[in-house]
Structures are given as C-alpha cells and as structure tokens.
Amino acid sequence: CDLPQTHSLGNRRALILLAQMGRISHFSCLKDRHDFGFPEEEFDGHQFQKAQAISVLHEMIQQTFNLFSTEDSSAAWEQSLLEKFSTELYQQLNDLEACVIQEVGVEETPLMNEDSILAVRKYFQRITLYLTEKKYSPCAWEVVRAEIMRSLSFSTNLQKRLRRKD
C-alpha cells in the first residue's frame, strides 16, 4: 500500500496546527515536565514488517485523536485550531485504515504487533493519568502538547522510512 503524498502533507499540517495551539508561555511550565515513557523502539521501523508499522502508526494517530476529542481538551484549546487538527488526524486515520486492510491481506501480522499496539496504548494511559493528576491544568496540557508533537514527529519519520522501502 502506498500512502498518498497528501498523507505526509497532512502529517506536517497536523504538527504545524499543534505548534500553533499553545496558549501560555511554555517557560512557566518547566517544573511540570514528565517522563511519559514514549515507546521509541516501536517507531524505529527496523524490526517491523510494513503491516505492523502501519497498524502501530494507526494506533498512535487514533489515540492522539481520542486524547484531543475529549471535553477537557475542548476546554483547553482554541476551538477552530482544535477542529482543524482533529480533521487532519481523521484524514490520516482513513488513509492508514485503507492501508491496514490492504497490507494485512498480503502478510500475516505476528503476535508481536499486539505488544507494540499495547505499548502505545499504555503510553497514552500514562498521559491521561498525568493530566488527571494535574487536574488538566494549562501547564499540564502544554507539557502534553509538547510530548505529542515529539511522538508525532517519530510517527512522521517512520512513515518516511516506510515510503523509502517501497
């Protein structure tokens, strides 16, 4: 499955929108930094078959979409930017879903992939727990926004590697 060129442009747009969503000076939030334990090894793309990589990417985007679709998120961010961001993520999910269906037919996905998807889910559980513990404060959301920008950058890089493999 070849992800359309518009998909990588969508990735870039999503990152730009996320960068624009900041509302407060990041410098006031330094002490709120937190180790969310991003599962970097699931995004290095070396040990993966293409179907596995696509399903991990799908899970990453899906969890990001879920996180920014909550009521608490709506209260934290400027509505028009949040809607645009969600739309970009939704489009990426559609692209990836089409690929997942196509690729799973080509190659069997080993159980190892379930571990990778579980690692991504647990990562987002840690983010949600952090937000809850911090009572969804503006700084907590700033830290999460920075973290998601970083994790989406990893996703973008994995997609670039997948395209080079084609």
């Epitope: 960068a19 990041h26 939030c29 330094l30 002490k31 930094r33 969310f36 920075a146 973290e147 950058s153």
Partner: antibody
Amino acid sequence: EVQLVQSGAEVKKPGESLKISCKGSGYSFTSYWIGWVRQMPGKGLEWMGIIDPSDSDTAYSPSFQGQVTISADKSISTAYLQWSSLKASDTAMYYCARHPGLNWAPDFDYWGQGTLVTVSS
Amino acid sequence: DIQMTQSPSSLSASVGDRVTITCRASQSIDGSLNWYQQKPGKAPKLLIYFASSLQSGVPSRFSGSGSGTDFTLTISSLQPEDFATYYCQQSYDFPLTFGQGTKVEIK
C-alpha cells in the same frame, strides 16, 4: 549530525553594539529551545536566557534582563544574542546550547564552540 | 532564584581514585539536576541529566544520584582525561542556575 556553530570572536569598544549568532543544523531547529550562557575569564557558567525559536518567546535571567536581547530567525535556523551598548564587563566567552523544552530529554545536550567577546577601549 | 552550592570548590586526586562532588539546591528541585564537565578552552559537556541518567556516549564510571535538594556526582575510578571542572545545574525552574564549579586537579 547535530551541530551548533557560533559566529567568530569579536573585539569591540565600550558603547558599541554587537550581535552574535548560533546556527543549528542536523535537527529540527524549532523543536528545541536555544539557551545562552556566559563565562567570564577564569569564572563559572552563568545562564543568561533562552528562546523558543518556534514562536520567539523568550525568558531571561534577572541579571541579564534589559542588558541583552535574544532573538531567532527560524527560516535560517539561527539564534542571536545582542547588545545595544557594550561595557568592559561584557568581556567573556558566550555559549549557545540547545534545550528540549518541555520534553523529557537531556538538557543542554549540544553546545556551540563559544564566541569570545572582548570589550576594550 | 534557586541557588546551587557545590562542594568542594576544588579537589586533588590521583588516577584510579573514587571522586565524589556534591551539589545542594536552596529549595527542592525534585530530580531536575544536570552535571557538566568542562575542560580549559572547551565548551561544557553534558554528563548526567535528570539527576541520574547517563548521557549517551559518557563513560559508565560517571554516575549521579540524589533528589530534592541534595545531589552527588561520582567518578568511580578517575582517569587522566577526567581532570576538569564540573558544574551542576538545576533545570526545575527559571532562571536556570549553575553551581560555582568544582575543579578536579591531579594530586
């Protein structure tokens, strides 16, 4: 390869203005903050201030607030430190270093080679 | 501002010695402490971040510990290339602040 390359040594007279630079390469420039650190001859490290190149937001140490200006041009991946009126006491080595911002990652993991500023009449 | 106090300000040691440098913060900084090594005429080099994480490429003889207000940098077996000045720095809040430095000299 991540690199921060600073502009060359400067010799200035008191009262003159100066702008030194720090060019980042090998990484996404807007994903990291750039901090500036002063080291006077034979002395320790002093943090001056920091900039987020993505939106040019800045924070300064109270000791340097109003004395220097930190800026950045993300289109050319460069941060700047400037003085409008230099004093002899500004004679020092100035370093830039990258900071991961609000991410849980090593602070000031890469440094520029330093710019020696000498202010003398 | 958070004050960072290092001790000792200088020490003399021999190759193979175990060396310990301490850093105390004027208020709790959790684990937001970094250690740097600087050699004459060179830029500082990050050794330890978040109190105990070893920076990539740094030899394992360097280790960091502590949290709250008291922190330690340990060199388990001093090597000739370790003679330098060491600085702690808090990254808990702005303004960021450094310790005054500890110079490790050859005995």
